[in-house]
């Protein structure tokens, strides 16, 4: 596969991953109440996210509310907020770096420098994936640990929410996409013949006598 194709595929995966990461960051479903106690008078589901939590009553009535204060949040939610937002912003920076290093753009002159910029974009996406993976795994670890902790009351036990799975899928896409961008940049430097297929040739200069080639005339 040519480096241009790797670049395009990598960028598409990274953009989808970035969208997934934004979705995971915003969704109030990082942890969802586990129904273990069937004696609870009124069944209700609680969803908790990084910015708000939602309660769905047995009647189907759902109410969501943004957290009252950053201070009122546990340390891991505060850290997860910072890391996830950091990853989203890093992906935004990585997009511009990748576009600057792309073979189909003219921000940077073609050559080793351009390939290095493209490589930097790929590395940034890889870092972005790793950065997002930290809060996702940390959160999941806490949820699972508390689920199996006998000292934690049943009403306080949670299960992994949809946002975590979306987040994991997004980080996978970011890392695969970042890897492809790195490969594309590497191919471009080591095998120039496999780089962007469209070649432009300079217009032919007129001869010294000022006459053009006869075949230009009908």
């Amino acid at each position: 596969m040519g480096s241009a194709a790797l670049e395009i595929l990598g960028l598409v995966l990274c953009l989808v991953g970035w969208g997934g990461l934004i979705l995971a960051c915003g969704l109030p479903m990082w942890q969802v109440t586990a129904f273990l106690d069937h004696n609870i008078v009124t069944a209700q589901t609680t969803w908790k996210g990084l910015w708000m939590s939602c309660v769905v009553q047995s009647t189907g009535h759902m109410q969501c509310k943004v957290y009252d204060s950053v201070l009122a949040l546990s340390t891991e939610v505060q850290a997860a907020r910072a890391l996830t937002v950091g990853a989203v912003l890093l992906a935004f920076v990585a997009l511009f770096v990748t576009l600057a290093g792309a073979q189909c753009t003219t921000c940077v002159a073609p050559g080793p420098a351009k390939a290095r910029v493209a490589l930097t974009g790929g590395v940034l996406y890889l870092l972005c994936g790793l950065l997002a993976l930290v809060p996702l795994c940390w959160f999941a670890n806490i949820v699972v640990r508390e689920f199996y902790d006998p000292s934690v009351p049943v009403s306080q036990k949670y299960e992994l929410g949809a946002a975590l799975y979306i987040g994991w899928a997004a980080t996978a896409l970011l890392m695969v996409g970042g890897g492809l961008l790195c490969c594309g940049a590497w191919v471009c430097t080591s095998r120039p013949d496999l780089s962007f297929p469209v070649k432009y040739s300079a217009p032919r200069r007129p001869t010294a006598t000022g006459d053009y080639d006869k075949k230009n005339y009908v």
Epitope: D68, L73, T75, V152
Partner: antibody, heavy 118, light 107 residues
Framework: QVQLKQSGPGLVQPSQSLSITCTVS????????VHWVRQSPGKGLEWLGV???????DYNGAFKSRLSISKDNSKSQVFFKMNSLQADDTAIYYC????????????WGTGTSVTVSS | DIVMTQSHKFMSTSVGDRVSITCKAS??????VAWYQQKPGQSPTLLIY???TRHTGVPDRFTGSGSGTDYTLTISSVQAEDLALYYC?????????FGAGTKLELR
Amino acid sequence: QVQLKQSGPGLVQPSQSLSITCTVSGFSLIRYGVHWVRQSPGKGLEWLGVKWSGGSTDYNGAFKSRLSISKDNSKSQVFFKMNSLQADDTAIYYCARGLDGYYVPDVWGTGTSVTVSS
Amino acid sequence: DIVMTQSHKFMSTSVGDRVSITCKASQDVSTNVAWYQQKPGQSPTLLIYWASTRHTGVPDRFTGSGSGTDYTLTISSVQAEDLALYYCQQHYSTPLTFGAGTKLELR
């Protein structure tokens, strides 16, 4: 089971300080904040302050100058200290766990009845 | 500070009746209101938060409603164990403030 058990003196001399320890079980102080509220017949329920899970503290401005709240996460204990008590500080003092993310005390402690008298 | 006013100090009711306890805030608290029940010699227990969300394990005969400055706690069919003191609290801003309480008693 979420529990908050309080220990402290029942009688305090005027101008002396009040110290109450709130020992929690069934939840971690790393994840939840602990509020302090008092209840007196004359003034009803008054919010005094909160020790957040991250370690920062919010105080009611009316008590800020003579109030101190600290905690020991490893011992699951929150410490409440109020200085310069007067007769109108006679009340039941409660510690209460904060609803995660919100300014809502959701599970309340047993309460410590404090009388300020000489 | 936001002042929470519970206009009725006492409310008389009978078992099976529907009763509504009201609370008025001195400014818009945008549904950041909680309701507590306190039985004699016991600590308060949380019933409702966010104006209308029942706390875990609270029977569905308790419902909260309201917006802006006016809030209501309704007990659809009063049971003997519901005879207690009820307090509203705003969690819109610090310092958190409570209403003076409404005592629900038998007629």
